[in-house]
Amino acid sequence: GIAIPRNSGCPNSEDKNFPRTVMVNLNIHNRNTSTNPKRSSDYYNRSTSPWNLHRNEDPERYPSVIWEAKCRHLGCVKADGNVDYHMNSVPIQQEILVLRREPRHCPNSFRLEKILVSVGCTCVTPIVHHVA
Amino acid sequence: GIAIPRNSGCPNSEDKNFPRTVMVNLNIHNRNTSTNPKRSSDYYNRSTSPWNLHRNEDPERYPSVIWEAKCRHLGCVKADGNVDYHMNSVPIQQEILVLRREPRHCPNSFRLEKILVSVGCTCVTPIVHHVA
C-alpha cells in the first residue's frame, strides 16, 4: 500500500499496517456542490433505453435506501416511440461501498461492503457469440 | 432514525443516539457473487452513447481510484456509425459514499463523504425549454 506520513494529531492506533478497523465520522461531507439534481432526474424517462427505479431498503445497511434501475424494455425506443429489438437496453452497473452493521443491530460497529447496483440503462448493439 | 435493538455483543459506545463516530471493519465483504464483470465491460464501446473512462486517483480517499465516464459525443451513434445530433448523449450520475482521511494522512481515522460520479452514458431525447 501507499506509505502515508503519520500525523502527530491522528487518533491513536495500535496497528502499524493499513488498519483493519478504523474510526469513521458519519457526519457526511457532501462534495456535490456544483450539480443540479434536477438535470438528470428525468433521464430515466427520456432515454432510448428507459428505466424504472426500485427502492431497495435494508435497515442493517448504511445507506439504508438504495435505488435500483430496471430497464423497461428488452430493446431500445425509436424516434417514433416503437421499440427496436435488434438493439438491447442494458443496465449500467457500478460497485459501490456501503456500511453493514456487524454484529447485526449494533449501532456503532460496521463492516465495509461492496455491492453492485444498476444505476440506469443504455442502448447497445448486440454482438454474435462466436463459438470457437 | 430507526430504533435499533441493542445487541449485548456490540462493541461499547458512550453515545446513546445514532453514532457520530463508529468503528468500521475494512475487510470488505463482496456481495457480488452472481455477476460476471465481463458482461458490462464493453458497454462503453457498444452503446449508442459511448463513453471513455477516466481515472480519478486520490490517496486521501478510500477507494483511492474511481473511474469517471465522459460521453464521447454530444449526439448518439446511429446504426450506420454516424452521430445523430437530434439526440443527446448524457452521463448517468450517481452519488456514492467514500471514506476521506481526516485528519489528513491519518491511517485509521476517516470521515464519510458523498461524491457524485458519472457511471456511463445514455441517449436521451432533448426537450424544449419553455420560457414562461
Epitope: 416503437n82 427496436d84 429489438y85 435488434h86 438491447n88 457469440h129 | 464493453d42
Partner: antibody, heavy 123, light 108 residues
C-alpha cells in the same frame, strides 16, 4: 457434446399446468440468452418466451403472457417453462433454443435447438 | 405485428438445380432477417442471419440477400440433403422472433 434436451411434456387437460425443463450441456450456459419456441402439429414455428443470461431481461409472446413463466437456474444449467391455464391451442412440440447473442444478451436468432418435447392439451 | 410471407409454399426441383426462395415482410425489417432449415422429425437449423451472413458450418451453396421488405434465400445447386422446409424470421419488431409460414423444397 453441445446439446439441449427438453423434458416434461405430456398429455394434460385444459386449464391445468405443466412445467417443461431444458438441460444444457457442452457449453457455458450462463454465456447465453435462452428461448422457448413451439411448433403446432403440421404448422410453422412460433416464439414463446426468452430470457437473458441473468434473468434480468424476459419476454413473452402475447399469446402466452400472464399464463407462462420462463426461468433459468445457471447453477444447474437448466431452463424452465411453467405453463399454467393451458388451452387446446397450446398443443405443440416445444423446443428449447439458444440465442446467438454474445455476453448472454439477446440477438433474437437461434443457433442451437433441442429435439423438442410434445405438449398435448386435450380433455 | 410484422407478417412474413414466404413464397412459393412448395418448390419442386431436382438435385443439382438452383432454388430461389422468397420472404416478404409487411413492413421494413432492414437487414434483420434470418433463414432456418427444418427436416422432418428434426429441430430447425440456422442457415443465414442478418440477411446475408452464413451461420457457422453452413455450406457455401446457401446464400441470402435482400433488405427492407424483400429477401431471398438461394441454394445454388441442390444436394439430396437440402430437401426440407425453410423458414424466414425477423428480429426487428415485436414480437422479436416472428417466423414466416415456410417453403417446402421437395424432390421433383
Amino acid at each position: 457434446e453441445v446439446q439441449l434436451v427438453e423434458s416434461g411434456g405430456g398429455l394434460v387437460q385444459p386449464g391445468r399446468s405443466l412445467r417443461l425443463s431444458c438441460a444444457a450441456s457442452g457449453f457455458t450456459f450462463d454465456d447465453y440468452a435462452m428461448h422457448w419456441v413451439r411448433q403446432a402439429p403440421g404448422k410453422g414455428l412460433e416464439w414463446v418466451s426468452g430470457i437473458n443470461w441473468n434473468s434480468g431481461g424476459i419476454g413473452y409472446a402475447d399469446s402466452v403472457k400472464g399464463r407462462f413463466t420462463i426461468s433459468r437456474d445457471n447453477a444447474k444449467n437448466s431452463l424452465y417453462l411453467q405453463m399454467n391455464s393451458l388451452r387446446a391451442e397450446d398443443t405443440a412440440l416445444y423446443y428449447c433454443a439458444r440465442d446467438m447473442g454474445g455476453f448472454g444478451e439477446f440477438y433474437w436468432n437461434f443457433g442451437l435447438w433441442g429435439r423438442g418435447t410434445l405438449v398435448t392439451v386435450s380433455s | 405485428e410484422i407478417v412474413l410471407t414466404q413464397s412459393p409454399a412448395t418448390l419442386s426441383l431436382s438435385p443439382g438445380e438452383r432454388a430461389t426462395l422468397s420472404c416478404r415482410a409487411s413492413q421494413s425489417v432492414r437487414s434483420y432477417l434470418a433463414w432456418y432449415q427444418q427436416k422432418p422429425g428434426q429441430a430447425p437449423r440456422l442457415l443465414i442471419y442478418d440477411a446475408s451472413n452464413r451461420a457457422t458450418g453452413i455450406p457455401a451453396r446457401f446464400s441470402g440477400s435482400g433488405s427492407g421488405t424483400d429477401f431471398t434465400l438461394t441454394i445454388s445447386s441442390l444436394e439430396p440433403e437440402d430437401f426440407a422446409v425453410y423458414y424466414c424470421q425477423q428480429r426487428s419488431n415485436w414480437p422479436p422472433a416472428t417466423f414466416g409460414g415456410g417453403t417446402k423444397v421437395e424432390i421433383k
